[in-house]
């Protein structure tokens, strides 16, 4: 019986050009994690494997950094990065647990920054 639960950062937003950490945590199970896949829609971004460590997909190498922990850091965000991201925990003996994160990348503008820090 699969008793585990995945906690994620949920729905998050970040500004274009910035970076964001995608984080999932598997809890409430003593199943051992053997690998964690990070996927965007049907594309594999990265995998952290028990015996091989981290592997970042070649097409994302410049913008994806492993960690912290089993999380993933996305850098130099573009509006096209908006969408669903999935952390897939492969465990023994439970099987597979999947967590979902929705990332919205927002356009940033000088005007917005100016207004935000304006002194009255």
């Amino acid at each position: 019986m699969m008793t585990g639960t995945i906690e994620t950062t949920g729905n998050i937003s970040a500004e274009k050009g910035g970076s964001i950490i995608l984080q999932c945590h598997l809890s409430s199970t003593t199943a051992q994690v053997t690998a964690v896949n990070w996927e965007q829609q049907d594309q594999l971004l990265a995998i952290c494997n028990a015996d091989l460590g981290w592997h970042i997909s070649p097409s994302f190498k410049d913008r994806v950094a492993p960690g912290p922990g089993l999380g993933l850091t996305l850098q130099s965000l573009t509006v096209n990065d908006t969408g669903e991201y999935f952390c897939i925990y492969h465990t023994y003996p439970d099987g597979t647990y999947t967590g979902r994160i929705f990332l919205e990348v927002l356009e940033s503008s000088v005007a917005e920054h100016g207004a935000r820090f304006q002194i009255p």
Epitope: T30, Q32, G69
Partner: antibody, heavy 119, light 113 residues
Framework: EVQLVESGGGLVKPGGSLKLSCAAS????????MSWVRQTPEKRLEWVAY????????YYPDTVKGRFTISRDNAKNTLYLQMSSLKSEDTAIYYC????????????WGQGTTLTVSS | DIVMSQSPSSLAVSVGEKVTMTCKSS????????????LAWYQQKPGQSPKLLIY???TRESGVPDRFTGSGSGTDFTLTISSVKAEDLAVYYC?????????FGGGTKLEIK
């Protein structure tokens, strides 16, 4: 150089409590899972507690569950083991040990701190 | 719980001899999805803490001399020291990290004649 230095051991009466500490240096502490492993007077090794890199997961064997609590302070690079309702069979050398993410063997061990539970 | 049994409990050999010690688990330590055996070997010299020698049953830890070799799969594992040195005087433990709770064998004490 990886260093793990345990402290806090001593003589405790049955039913008593004690908190052990492990100061880590020479590596990025928050990137590693950690465990406490003890060695009994008969030289047997027993794993007693595990905590994940960020502290969100903890596991214990049935022998100590409900009596021992593992925790960590990543800002201070320190691992802790709070022990309560101590029994004579908890007498041992307690080691803190490092684990690489997703690999559950112990790649570095501290020098150990001794707990004696006796009246 | 997975029970780990080591044999012999002790042995005495002369410098230069080959040594073999065994470790048996009560259930398979082979994980089918990655074909890895979740078994480690440790060396504990007198007055010291344990030191990792071998993981994944056969992968030597960095800095460990190549006279130490781990082998085996499933439930039967072996640690071999091809040519014993005086500094190998120690107790050797196997550990399974296949499933909770992680468990150790009782150890094999290597003595030098």
């Amino acid at each position: 150089e990886v260093q793990l230095v345990e402290s806090g051991g001593g003589l405790v009466k049955p039913g008593g409590s004690l908190k052990l500490s492990c100061a880590a240096s020479g590596f990025a502490f928050s990137d590693y899972d950690m465990s406490w492993v003890r060695q009994t007077p008969e030289k047997r090794l027993e794993w007693v507690a595990y905590i994940s890199d960020g502290g969100y997961n903890t596991y214990y064997p049935d022998t100590v569950k409900g009596r021992f609590t593992i925790s960590r302070d990543n800002a201070k690079n320190t691992l802790y083991l709070q022990m309560s309702s101590l029994k004579s069979e908890d007498t041992a050398i307690y080691y803190c040990a490092r684990q690489i993410l997703l690999r559950y063997y112990f790649d570095y061990w501290g020098q150990g701190t001794t707990l004696t539970v006796s009246s | 719980d997975i029970v780990m049994s080591q044999s012999p409990s002790s042995l005495a050999v002369s410098v230069g001899e080959k040594v073999t010690m065994t470790c048996k688990s009560s259930q398979s330590l082979l994980y089918s999805s990655n074909q890895k055996n979740y078994l480690a070997w440790y060396q504990q010299k007198p007055g010291q803490s344990p030191k990792l020698l071998i993981y994944w049953a056969s992968t030597r830890e960095s800095g460990v001399p190549d006279r130490f070799t781990g082998s085996g799969s499933g439930t039967d594992f072996t640690l071999t020291i091809s040519s014993v040195k005086a500094e190998d005087l120690a107790v050797y433990y196997c550990q399974q990290y296949h499933s909770y709770p992680w468990t150790f064998g009782g150890g094999t004490k290597l003595e030098i004649k």
